[in-house]
Interface confidence: low
């Protein structure tokens, strides 16, 4: 439905508070280096303009597209060239090229200082002094560090952030109340950001059809009682929502997401029996709840898949008439029967089925040719099952920290050219699959583990894309979205890698390590482990374990010493010498 003024339409649909919050998120995700105050000023100017359009949709400039209005506003920033360099060239372009240009300059790893959490009393004072500014600052800081964060979901996080401060700043023990809530929000926020980043990468790097296929599989698992037409409608709408958010169209995205939640709740009888509680919640909670809702029970009387997709004489006819619809139906039918499979496995099966039909429908006897197609699925199903079984056994044997270390060594040997911070971050996250998924029963392990690994490996892909250093990473990241994990799993030690020169400075530690949190201390040790492997890629597990055990003992000893700094200096030299000898450096 055409509106005379798009900005007025969205302002009225979303309300002033959400409008302002979403424009702030959009601007912070585009101009990630701009100070908070500059963004607030721009948002206020846009909001005042939107109000004039609400009052009179025919007023000057009110008929302009949101991209034009927002892009014009961003291009008024005085320091654009100095702060952003070539991004300033975007402003010489016309829409839609200008917006595409801004999108291409989004930085997944912006050079911003780490967010340091102030004392609880300081935070509570700031919250009470100016609640609105405090919450806006939260949106701004998250959005600029996570330029693809799912904007309507960030509003949900901000609501929970506000609730935490409202409750805990009145509590007897503010810190005990607040800190666990903030930790939970931080961890959930990082996970949410990474999941959305994969959705955007799917859309932007592999196209709408790739995202739709993913959505068909996931929604069919979640809503196995819904008919194919219903799932198709939801997939189409969900694709529109995520295309908009990934494209920076945050007002449209939030509006359409609200419409989708409304539709799902109005039609829950034909979608899922698990939606009742979600649909009683307010909008932000409702949308979040629907996105996380558990899988509905599978219908009891589902017939064998073979009848329609192998035994039927019409397989090639149905396939030829509408290939992607037929494959979509195959994916829907397979996925609703297999909540125990990962989405990426389901997509591999669909791809195999498609390849078989492509070959067989051109053969002399098509039916004879594709009759055994389901047998081809067996190795594809067993590969992730075996991998998860082996890794969960290793995790249970080692615990999370040492399991992460095993993965650090494994991945550094596979792709040693990747930067040490990226290897540490990615391997730590890969290692979290153990505590996240291995506790689940067999039927839930694969969807938990392999789909989580897809999210983490996408982090590696987007970070590597910014500064590509490894052809092997590029190959695994770009060749096939659904085969990324098997591609990385299949990589062996990179025999072409020339070991890094030994640099004693890399292994010099100071007393400041003693005051770090356990997590930060682990990261320091894991950074050293990656560097060790880069120096000595042929080192055995036993050699590396011995050096790491010595290192842990050295840190513990020096942190207990009276003169910590001297201990670190003297014992550190000994440790480096002993390690060099042990590893033959």
């Amino acid at each position: 439905d055409a509106h005379k003024s798009e900005v007025a339409h969205r302002f009225k649909d979303l309300g002033e508070e959400n409008f302002k919050a979403l424009v702030l998120i959009a601007f912070a995700q585009y101009l990630q280096q701009c100070p908070f105050e500059d963004h607030v000023k721009l948002v206020n100017e846009v909001t005042e303009f939107a109000k004039t359009c609400v009052a009179d949709e025919s007023a000057e400039n009110c008929d302009k597209s949101l991209h034009t209005l927002f892009g014009d506003k961003l291009c008024t920033v005085a320091t654009l060239r100095e702060t952003y360099g070539e991004m300033a060239d975007c402003c010489a372009k016309q829409e839609p090229e200008r917006n595409e240009c801004f999108l291409q300059h989004k930085d997944d790893n912006p050079n911003l200082p780490r967010l340091v959490r102030p004392e609880v009393d300081v935070m509570c004072t700031a919250f009470h002094d100016n609640e609105e500014t405090f919450l806006k600052k939260y949106l701004y800081e998250i959005a600029r560090r996570h330029p693809y964060f799912y904007a309507p979901e960030l509003l949900f996080f901000a609501k929970r952030y506000k609730a935490a401060f409202t409750e805990c700043c009145q509590a007897a023990d503010k810190a005990a109340c607040l800190l666990p809530k903030l930790d939970e929000l931080r961890d959930e926020g990082k996970a949410s950001s990474a999941k959305q980043r994969l959705k955007c990468a799917s859309l932007q790097k592999f196209g709408e059809r790739a995202f739709k296929a993913w959505a068909v599989a996931r929604l069919s698992q979640r809503f196995p009682k819904a008919e194919f037409a219903e799932v198709s409608k939801l997939v189409t709408d969900l694709t529109k929502v995520h295309t908009e958010c990934c494209h920076g169209d945050l007002l449209e995205c939030a509006d359409d997401r609200a419409d989708l939640a409304k539709y799902i709740c109005e039609n829950q009888d034909s979608i899922s029996s698990k939606l009742k509680e979600c649909c009683e919640k307010p909008l932000l909670e409702k949308s979040h709840c629907i996105a996380e809702v558990e899988n509905d029970e599978m219908p009891a009387d589902l017939p064998s898949l073979a009848a329609d997709f192998v035994e039927s004489k019409d397989v090639c006819k149905n396939y030829a008439e509408a290939k992607d619809v037929f494959l979509g139906m195959f994916l829907y039918e397979y996925a609703r029967r297999h909540p125990d499979y990962s989405v990426v496995l389901l997509l591999r099966l669909a791809k195999t089925y498609e390849t078989t039909l492509e070959k067989c429908c051109a053969a002399a006897d098509p039916h004879e040719c594709y009759a055994k197609v389901f047998d081809e699925f067996k190795p594809l199903v067993e590969e992730p099952q075996n991998l998860i079984k082996q890794n969960c056994e290793l995790f249970e044997q080692l615990g999370e920290y040492k399991f992460q270390n095993a993965l650090l060594v494994r991945y550094t040997k596979k792709v040693p050219q990747v930067s040490t911070p990226t290897l540490v971050e990615v391997s730590r996250n890969l290692g979290k699959v153990g505590s996240k998924c291995c506790k689940h029963p067999e039927a839930k392990r694969m969807p938990c583990a392999e789909d989580y690994l897809s999210v983490v490996l996408n982090q590696l892909c987007v970070l590597h894309e910014k500064t590509p250093v490894s052809d092997r990473v590029t190959k695994c990241c770009t060749e096939s979205l659904v085969n990324r994990r098997p591609c990385f799993s299949a990589l062996e030690v990179d025999e072409t890698y020339v070991p890094k020169e030994f640099n004693a400075e890399t292994f010099t530690f100071h007393a400041d390590i003693c005051t770090l949190s356990e997590k930060e201390r682990q990261i320091k040790k894991q950074t050293a482990l990656v560097e060790l492997v880069k120096h000595k890629p042929k080192a055995t597990k036993e050699q590396l374990k011995a050096v790491m055990d010595d290192f842990a003992a050295f840190v513990e000893k020096c942190c207990k010493a009276d003169d910590k700094e001297t201990c670190f200096a003297e014992e550190g030299k000994k440790l480096v010498a002993a390690s060099q000898a042990a590893l033959g450096l």
């Epitope: 790097k205 196209g207 790739a210 494959l327």
Partner: nanobody
Framework: HVQLVESGGGLVQAGGSLRLSCAAS????????MGWFRQPPGKEREFVAA????????FYRDSVKGRFTISRDNAKNTVYLQMNSLKSEDTAVYFC????????????????????WGQGTQVTVSS
């Protein structure tokens, strides 16, 4: 979105050669699988050739194999179709098409799976 513009068509004698170009604007072509299709007079549109985005693998319809060559120059944002030993049955409007890598459709020949199309360029081979 990507916009595609074909050029290089024209009238040529049987046995002659033409080189069609397809220039893209709006987005870099390196993200796309590219294909050439054609529509002979009074007939359905048909696949001619395709080239993948990753490894530059090429595919051809049987009747043009050995005569036509598809290539791409990502730096110039252009895809080419070199047509040699042209025959009268090659007469058609030639269309350039681009597709983001779909999860399905490994078959490059399936026109509905291409996302973007040019307006076409006429090739007439006279005998």
């Amino acid at each position: 979105h990507v916009q595609l513009v074909e050029s290089g068509g024209g009238l040529v004698q049987a046995g002659g050669s033409l080189r069609l170009s397809c220039a893209a604007s709006g987005r870099t072509l390196s993200s796309y699988d590219m294909g050439w299709f054609r529509q002979p007079p009074g007939k359905e549109r048909e696949f001619v050739a395709a080239i993948t985005r990753h490894d530059f693998n090429t595919f051809y319809r049987d009747s043009v194999k050995g005569r036509f060559t598809i290539s791409r120059d990502n730096a110039k944002n252009t895809v080419y179709l070199q047509m040699n030993s042209l025959k009268s049955e090659d007469t058609a409007v030639y269309f350039c098409a681009a597709r983001l890598d779909p999860i399905f459709a490994s078959n490059s020949e399936y026109a509905p799976l291409y996302d973007y199309w040019g307006q076409g360029t006429q090739v007439t081979v006279s005998s």
